[in-house]
């Protein structure tokens, strides 16, 4: 039994780090493998993560962690029974993938304006809470070419756009994702999408 692709890990900078790797053949990850992780810190203890299958030869492990600080560094040991398959380390603050925003809502009752709001996925005491920026993706269910991205570079988790920038009488979907420049994070996963029917009054044309 060998590791084909070494574990790579990302942290949500809150309570979970996710490590993925591939074995050289079909593996029952949860029964055959264990990922041990330990904070490099005085009097820390080793903790065990039981991996799950992620495709035939792929494994994924969700490492439970305390709140992350930039100094944190973990040793990682991948074991198959008594055999050490791989040894590495992981610094969560250098491999951050934010949590996806939630509760995306489209408010259509504001006069000819669409107000999109969503929730910041972090509690106020988390460092990332005040450092997230967002990308909002809006697309038409009818027209694949009608696909747009709005970058939200301010802290407020909301976006206002004129309803008239979209076609009237058509159903649209929106989703949002987040990233944090301060830690040079990757983008989060997209939030679940939300759907609405876009309709607005065409301005009265005088001849």
């Amino acid at each position: 039994m060998k590791v084909l692709q070494e574990p790579t890990c990302v942290s949500d900078y809150m309570s979970i780090s996710t490590c993925e790797w591939k074995m050289n053949g079909p593996t029952n990850c949860s029964t055959e493998l264990r990922l041990l992780y330990q904070l490099v810190f005085l009097l820390s203890e080793a903790h065990t993560c039981i991996p799950e299958n992620n495709g035939g030869a792929g494994c994924v492990c969700h490492l439970l962690m305390d709140d992350v600080v930039s100094a944190d560094n973990y040793t990682l040991d991948l074991w198959a029974g008594q055999q050490l398959l791989w040894k590495g380390s992981f610094k969560p603050s250098e491999h951050v993938k934010p949590r996806a925003p939630g509760n995306l809502t489209v408010h259509t009752n504001v006069s000819d304006t669409l107000l999109l709001t969503w929730s910041n996925p972090y509690p106020p005491d988390n460092y990332l809470y005040n450092h997230l920026t967002y990308a909002v993706n809006i697309w038409s269910e009818n027209d694949p070419a009608d696909f747009r991205i709005y970058n939200v570079t301010y802290l407020e988790p909301s976006l206002r756009i004129a309803a008239s920038t979209l076609k009237s009488g058509i159903s649209y979907r929106a989703r949002v994702r987040a990233w944090a420049q301060c830690y040079n994070t990757t983008w989060s996963e997209w939030s679940p999408s939300t759907k609405w029917h876009n309709s607005y009054r065409e301005p009265f044309e005088q001849h």
């Epitope: 904070l39 810190f41 005085l42 009097l43 820390s44 203890e45 080793a46 962690m65 305390d66 600080v69």
Partner: antibody, heavy 125, light 112 residues
């Protein structure tokens, strides 16, 4: 009441051995790291050794490394310090102390918040 | 190894007056914001040491609020706002950031 009680001290000749014990009560012993500190007559405090809650990680002062062994039996809520090749300079009062909560991912530190009454070790010929 | 240097080594104080003890570490004991691994202990004559302050500024349970700790990185201070007769003894700072733990030399507080 959280309590630590040391025992095992006494008079020993240079080169001899002693085993100190520290019985813990009133807290979940296995969840906490434990530490030994000593104090030579008329001197200040000197850290000797520490062990994590699961016993998997141990640390020693250079002055005792290779001679002293720290261990614990969590089923008996007891900490030990095996002292071999004793020297005159090991003469001191030995205290055990409750250290950080080490079962969490990042150990949570509250200081050495509980100390035993101390046990006296005298090394002399 | 980290060296912990305390000053003064002797501190005569009049009851009711404030007192201050300094402790300097040879390297930073700051792990992350709010986590300075420095403690203060008091050892009264014939007794075991007792914890006063941990993590630089957190008062241990049951410690009177006249005791306070401050500082970050390498410089730390223990202050007693109004010294009482029962406060006499030896005060030690200690770093618990890395092995080996190291105590300061101790400061003897006595009543004038």
């Amino acid at each position: 009441e959280v309590q630590l009680v040391e025992s095992g001290g006494g008079l020993e000749q240079p080169g001899g051995s002693l085993r100190l014990s520290c019985a813990g009560s009133g807290f979940t012993f296995r969840d906490f790291a434990m530490t030994w500190v000593r104090q030579a007559p008329g001197k200040g405090l000197e850290w000797v050794s520490s062990v994590s809650g699961d016993g998997g990680n141990t640390y020693y002062a250079d002055s005792v490394k290779g001679r002293f062994t720290i261990s614990r039996d969590n089923s008996k809520n007891t900490l030990y310090l095996q002292m071999n090749s004793l020297r005159a300079e090991d003469t001191a009062v030995y205290y055990c102390a409750k250290d950080r909560l080490s079962k969490t991912i990042r150990p949570r530190y509250y200081g050495l918040d509980v100390w035993g009454q101390g046990t006296t070790v005298t090394v002399s010929s | 190894d980290i060296v912990m240097t305390q000053s003064p080594l002797s501190l005569p104080v009049t009851p009711g007056e404030p007192a201050s003890i300094s402790c300097r570490s040879s390297q930073s004991v700051l792990y992350s914001i709010g986590y300075n691994y420095v403690d203060w202990y008091l050892q009264k004559s014939g007794q075991s040491p007792q914890l006063l302050i941990y993590l630089g500024n957190k008062r241990a349970s049951g410690v009177p609020d006249r005791f306070s700790g401050s500082g970050s990185g390498t410089d730390f201070t223990l202050k007693i706002s109004r010294v009482e007769a029962e406060d006499v003894g030896f005060y030690y700072c200690m770093q618990a950031y890395q092995s080996p733990y190291v105590f300061g030399q101790g400061t003897k507080l006595e009543i004038k």
